[in-house]
Interface confidence: medium
């Protein structure tokens, strides 16, 4: 799996999308988990509705929401009021029994809010470093890293 980088600004919302083959994953619930360490577990943050037919309903856990377009094959995760410690490595997963298949590996980067001067002496502001190749701007900036970048250990 490639790893896709999504950038968001502290205090704002970040939307992460994970496309998948809707036929291959038909009937499967989805989840969003955080990779805590190189060989550590992928800790479940939030999962879609217990009833697969209701997967389109947004489910929240704290400031993180998940919703699944099962026909279009797009899982969407929203991180509301993004904070520095939300930055990290995550996975979109497709669940079947006690197993989980990785749909997408995601690196969330949190940029400082240019209008927040509390720690301005230490923070990086958007625009100070080179832009991503092939970046597209929506609610987030995302790009795919090269094959083999940011290896994830197997989900435990």
């Amino acid at each position: 799996h490639n790893t896709t980088v999504f950038q968001g600004v502290a205090g704002q919302s970040l939307q992460v999308s994970c496309p998948y083959d809707s036929m291959k994953h038909w009937g499967r619930r989805k989840a969003w988990c955080r990779q805590l360490g190189e060989k550590g577990p992928c800790q479940r943050v939030v999962s879609t509705h217990n009833l697969w037919l209701l997967s389109f309903l947004r489910r929240w856990n704290g400031s993180t929401a998940i919703t699944d377009d099962t026909l279009g094959g797009t899982l969407t995760i929203t991180l509301r009021n993004l904070q520095p410690h939300d930055a990290g490595l995550y996975q979109c997963q497709s669940l079947h029994g006690s197993e989980a298949d990785t749909l997408r590996k995601v690196l969330v980067e949190v940029l400082a809010d240019p209008l927040d001067h509390r720690d301005a002496g230490d923070l990086w502001f958007p625009g100070e470093s080179e832009s991503f190749e092939d970046a597209h701007v929506e609610h987030s900036i995302s790009r795919s890293l090269l094959e083999g970048e940011i290896p994830f250990p197997p989900t435990s």
Epitope: L36, G37, H85, V110, L111, D122, W124, S129, E149
Partner: antibody
């Protein structure tokens, strides 16, 4: 096996410059956030600077901002710390460290180099 | 900066003892806390992260507990090779380290 090897330390006069290097092996260097952490008998362990993967964002502690510059050369798997306008309070062992993904400047540091001593004195 | 206070600064214990090291944060750091082991003349090694997850390679006699402001590192049965200085680090808000606890054998 993950290995981080620092070089470039030594004795330097106040106001002068020094460059530290850290050669990384045993992992895909370009994939990881990296950092410099220093340790002095008086101040203990202090995070100094970090650089992210991907966008290469850089972060510094207040006391070194504008004087120190962290950079990386992914092709050479090498991390650098350019230290200018050095002060006596910068005297410490400097460690190159790999950091896990999170936060602005630092999450936890999962691998450290053996450290290199920097002494700022006239 | 969030101040991290470790106690005691020096701890003498015997082989086989159950050893408890304390780390207190000046404000809530949730579970964003790591412990490091540093042996004399060596670099620190990550021991525990996220307050209670043991880093691969360390024996199960090491464990971490706590959340918020009070954290504990426990060695269930002290071994000679555990002699070292132990540091805690918070990474909830920027990052700061404790002053360390030096653990020695009686």
């Amino acid at each position: 096996e993950v290995q981080l090897v620092e070089s470039g330390g030594g004795l330097v006069q106040p106001g002068r410059s020094m460059m530290l290097s850290c050669s990384a092996s045993g992992f895909t260097f370009s994939n990881y956030h990296m950092a410099w952490v220093r340790q002095a008998p008086t101040t203990g362990l202090e995070w100094v600077a970090s650089i992210t993967t991907g966008s290469g964002n850089t972060y510094y502690r207040h006391s070194v901002k504008g004087r120190f510059t962290i950079s990386r050369d992914n092709a050479k798997s090498t991390l650098y710390l350019q230290m200018d306008s050095l002060r006596s309070e910068d005297t410490a062992s400097y460690y190159c460290a790999r950091r896990w993904y999170g936060g602005y400047e630092g999450y936890y540091f999962d691998y450290w180099g053996q450290g290199v001593m920097v002494t700022v004195s006239s | 900066d969030i101040q991290m206070t470790q106690s005691p600064s020096l701890l003498s214990a015997s082989v086989g003892d159950r050893v408890t090291l304390s780390c207190k944060a000046g404000q809530n750091v949730n579970n964003y806390l790591a412990w490091y082991q540093q042996k004399l003349g060596e670099a620190p090694k990550l021991l525990i992260y996220n307050a209670n997850i043991l880093q691969t390679g360390f024996p199960s006699r090491f464990s971490g507990t706590g959340s918020g402001t009070d954290f504990t590192l426990t060695i269930s049965s002290l071994q000679p090779e555990d002699v070292a200085t132990y540091f805690c680090q918070q990474y909830n808000s920027w990052t700061t380290f404790g002053g360390g606890t030096k653990l020695e054998l009686k």
